[in-house]
Interface confidence: low
């Protein structure tokens, strides 16, 4: 004789009782009414199960909550099922058996039917696990039921001080969706908040789980697929104040079935977004966007932000959204890079794009901008990187495309190619009024517009000029004069550890900033506009340094241990970290600080010039770094502002030294023999290069490196030309937000 092997199968669900009404008392687990009604309801549930063939497998059950509508009972029950039958008793099958029983007019009228009129239609049965019940039970000392009426924003009461776990059980009108807003009120905590697309904490219905006070998402809004949601909080460390605020509302289902007709132009024409963007998309999201293109000359480009698409085998679910584009199945995934999906047009009836959430786990709302591109020339003057759909500079010495194809088959790399014989001349010799090419092609078209390319400067009117680095050189090269606008910059006022450096004089580096917390120098920075200082994002990676309120910015400073009349200090009103910054890789290591009031420029305080995206800093060029960093590896910060000259290093040489961990957003400078370098405390400080015009341009920001001044290991800087679009975007959008 062999004992039959059974497995415990847990089911969770809800049922509606038509002849009972919900009362406030039933919403409180500690009330007498709750205890009495839950005991009766549990008996009813037990009898209901016992009346079916599931009765023989019954183990235990619990009615753990009540809700509106007229009275909804939320429950779980466990069946001990023979192993061989486990797969046959799915939640759908169990529901069917229970519904059949509710609809049957059996002669022996079960006692549960006399007292409870259960609505068969409203029966919900979901798969659960023993662990789900454990989690649920751990919250019962702090269980909060709330019914969310339409139109109201309901703030949810924070957790009780003495409890370690709470559950907010949220329910709204059946035809609406629950939307929860979670706002972290502190920057450091170890609390965990999980949201479920069900009345209880069912792992299989998890929408999202956040741990600690999320700096990436200080405020998040999360949608359920329908009118119920459970939010579970687990305490991290003791705190007198709640580290978060919760509120909830019931919102209407938003349609995302759109037909759009694009116009025959190449700029961005609009965006597609998941309902309630930037809220998390709902587990029930299904969007269908049909875009019609004016002619087959064009292809359609979808521009994603921190989200990309890739092919996925059909038998694998997409965990971050499924996309169907022209019958191709793609899976979305979050990434800290830009991405474009290019859709070549083969038929004139346009393209249908479907976005579907395949699982309950969702993520931040997705927004995609759309535009057209010329199918015959998708990237005028640039290279189309097929890996990520982006147009990147070609043959500039930097492998922008992950496969490096933008730097293959180059006749002249980071140089000008003469038309006559394909000889290469250095870029500063182009349009310098000295013919260097055989027939002088380097000096042609210098006074007129040329097709845009990697090294051409784009004027404000979108035309391009051939002369490299024409900004602020005292000559108007653009028809609209835009190359000579915003030129109140880059002039020295007078006349980190900076390893191998020398002391600076007053006004020599008037853009240099000292970023301090409680009187202690932490990082360097550079003034780029009257309310903006640029620095490195990694200066803020510690939770304890993430708040702008902590920081003071000093400009015009010379010595750390004393103040002098030429220096001024500012509080920081806002802090912007590059959205793609990644701590581990140091990529996109840039941040912007908005000062609390405008800077008054003087001989000792004025901004450095920002380079255009096309600005070329030539490898081999001597530039300067400045800061109060340590003067030897592991040493203390310097008292006096130090300066040191460093040489710009070709990208491939640096990439080799650092085993290919150098991204296109990085620039290297230093010397093979080491010695001269930045060090701890110089982070975020400026690497500046002087143009022939005498103006200083910001080439880089001190970012990372192996040690300080070590032979064969150059200093690595954030390459400003590769993040300049983001810088301009922030300055433009927030210059008025005082």
């Amino acid at each position: 004789y062999k004992a039959e092997v059974t497995v415990s199968q847990v089911y969770s669900g809800s049922l509606r009782v038509l002849n009972r009404h919900f009362s406030q008392d039933l919403g409180r687990r500690e009330s007498i009414a709750f205890r009495s009604e839950s005991a009766k309801a549990q008996k009813m549930l037990q009898e209901l199960v016992a009346s079916t063939r599931l009765g023989t497998y019954y183990n235990s059950s619990s009615v753990y909550s009540f809700g509106e509508g007229p009275l909804t009972c939320f429950f779980w029950f466990i069946l001990d099922i023979p192993e061989y039958q486990r797969l046959t008793l799915s939640p759908e099958v169990v529901r069917e058996l229970l519904v059949d029983e509710l609809l049957s007019n059996s002669s022996t009228l079960a006692s549960y039917k006399t007292e409870y009129e259960v609505d068969p239609e409203g029966l919900v049965i979901l798969e659960a696990s023993v662990n789900d019940i454990v989690v649920l039970n751990s919250t019962l000392g702090c269980y909060r039921y709330s019914y969310v009426n339409p139109g109201q924003v309901l703030p949810l009461k924070g957790p009780d001080q003495q409890t370690t776990s709470c559950l907010w059980h949220l329910q709204g009108p059946e035809d609406l969706m629950i939307k929860v807003r979670l706002e972290w009120t502190r920057v450091d905590c170890r609390d965990r908040v999980a949201m479920y697309d069900a009345a209880g904490p069912l792992e299989k219905r998890l929408i999202t789980s956040v741990y600690g006070c999320s700096r990436q998402e200080p405020v998040m809004e999360v949608l359920a697929s329908g009118s119920v949601m459970a939010v579970v909080w687990k305490k991290g460390m003791h705190s007198y104040y709640d580290p978060f605020l919760l509120s909830v509302k019931s919102v209407a289902f938003q349609d995302c079935q759109v037909n759009l007709t694009l116009e025959g132009r190449l700029d961005t024409q609009g965006f597609l977004r998941t309902p309630y963007y930037p809220s998390y998309y709902s587990p029930s999201t299904h969007c269908s966007w049909h875009l019609t293109v004016p002619s087959l000359d064009y292809g359609l480009a979808l521009w994603f932000d921190a989200y990309a698409l890739r092919r996925q085998k059909y038998n694998r679910l997409c965990t971050q959204g499924q996309w169907m584009i022209q019958n191709r199945r793609l899976c979305g995934f979050r990434t800290l890079q830009p991405y474009a999906e290019r859709i070549p047009m083969v038929a004139s009836d346009g393209v249908t794009i479907n976005f579907t959430s395949q699982i309950s786990l969702t993520g931040p709302g997705v927004q995609v901008y759309y535009s057209l591109y010329n199918q015959s020339d998708p990237c005028p003057g640039e290279f189309l990187c097929s890996v990520n759909g982006l147009c990147v500079p070609a043959c500039d010495g930097i492998k922008d495309c992950p496969n490096g194809l933008d730097e293959r088959n180059c006749v002249c790399r980071a140089m000008f190619q003469c038309q006559e014989d394909s000889t290469c001349i250095s870029l500063p010799r182009v349009c310098d009024r000295q013919p260097d090419c055989l027939n002088g092609s380097d000096e042609e078209q210098c006074q007129e517009g040329v097709p845009c390319g990697t090294f051409t400067f784009q004027c404000e009117d979108r035309s391009c000029v051939k002369k490299p680095n024409p900004e602020c050189d005292g000559q108007s090269d653009c028809r609209d004069g835009s190359d000579e606008q915003h030129c109140d910059c880059g002039l020295q006022g007078l006349s980190s550890r900076i390893v191998g450096g020398t002391v600076s004089s007053e006004g020599e580096w008037p853009w240099q900033a000292s970023l301090q917390i409680r009187g202690r120098h932490i990082c360097g920075g550079a003034l780029i506009a009257d309310r903006w200082v640029i620095t490195a994002a990694h200066c803020f990676q510690e939770d304890s340094m993430a708040s702008p309120k902590l920081w003071t910015v000093f400009l015009g400073k010379m010595r750390q241990n004393s103040r002098w009349p030429g220096e001024v200090s500012f509080k920081v009103s806002r802090l912007f970290l590059h959205p793609y910054h990644e701590e581990d890789s140091h990529d996109y290591d840039v941040a912007l600080l908005q000062l609390d009031h405008p800077v008054v420029y003087s001989a000792t305080v004025r901004p450095v010039c920002l380079p255009a995206r096309s600005h070329f800093f030539e490898p081999g060029q001597h530039c300067w770094i400045t800061g109060w960093g340590a003067q030897r590896e592991g040493g203390p910060v310097s008292n006096t502002l130090q300066k040191v000259d460093v040489q710009l290093v070709p990208q491939d040489l640096c990439s080799e030294a650092y085993r290919y961990q150098v991204s296109p957003r990085m620039l290297c400078a230093g010397y093979r023999k080491g010695k001269k370098d930045a060090c701890q405390g110089d982070s975020g400080g400026p690497l500046v290069c002087r143009e022939p015009s005498g103006r200083w341009f910001l080439a880089g920001l001190v970012s990372w490196g192996l040690g300080c001044g070590r032979p064969n290991f150059f200093g690595v800087y954030t390459r400003v030309t590769r993040v300049i679009n983001w810088i301009q975007q922030v300055l433009t959008h927030h210059h008025h937000h005082h």
Partner: antibody, heavy 118, light 107 residues
């Protein structure tokens, strides 16, 4: 549903100040920017300024800087606009409106007529 | 400040007509442009924002186009309730500025 209800019409003498209130319902003002826009008889709309009630950060039009003050009362879900040193050319209908971040003003109050005359 | 110029200042049209109103910005405002409708004695109502996006509840006969400095509001088939004054507004940078308005009257 979203509603912005403004205080009633005012008659003021030149040099005086006026304070107009804007009570919001159907949404939380802390989630939005609150703007004030005015329209003199037969004239175009003129943006005066805005506030982010979450942190009381204000941005004013240079034309009104120094004369206008916008303040929130988040507990009452209300925004206020005070205009000082009134002159006859300040006679206008004053509107409050809300916006999300960089989007324009999607819902407006019914307007408050302020008449300045001696 | 960014100047906004609308044309025409006024226009007469009949029910069923297709009407176009243009708005020009004195500098590039990308696609940060909104259109409002205002009837006498009423507050403005948002029709279009980000140059082309219809506000919820706005009939599909209203459409917006343009980017940079030149923008257009089109009403494909005029209805009796569309006779009003229309304003454009740049929401690109503060101070936000409005056009002088286009009064649409019944012919």
């Amino acid at each position: 549903q979203v509603q912005l209800v403004q205080s009633g019409a005012e008659v003021k003498k030149p040099g005086a100040s006026v304070k107009v209130s804007c009570k919001a319902s159907g949404f939380n003002i802390e989630d939005y920017y609150m703007h004030w826009v005015r329209q003199a008889p037969g004239q175009r709309l003129e943006w005066m300024g805005r506030i982010d009630p979450e942190d009381a950060e204000t941005t004013y039009s240079p034309k009104f800087q120094g004369r206008v003050t916008i303040i929130p009362d988040t507990s009452a879900n209300t925004a206020y606009m005070e205009l000082s040193s009134l002159r006859s050319e300040d006679t206008a209908v004053y509107y409050c409106a809300r916006s999300i971040y960089l989007d324009p003003m999607d819902y407006w109050g019914q307007g408050t007529l302020v008449t300045v005359s001696s | 400040d960014i100047q906004m110029t609308q044309s025409p200042k006024s226009l007469s049209a009949s029910v069923g007509d297709r009407v176009t109103i243009t708005c020009r910005a004195s500098q590039d405002v990308t696609t940060a442009l909104a259109w409002y409708q205002q009837k006498p004695g009423q507050s403005p109502k948002l029709l279009i924002y980000w140059a082309t996006t219809r506000h919820s509840g706005v009939p599909s006969r209203f459409s917006g186009s343009g980017s940079g400095t030149d923008f257009t509001l089109t009403i494909s088939s005029l209805q009796p309730e569309d006779f009003a004054t229309y304003y454009c507004q740049q929401h690109y940078s503060t101070p936000y500025t409005f056009g002088q308005g286009t009064k649409l009257e019944i012919k």
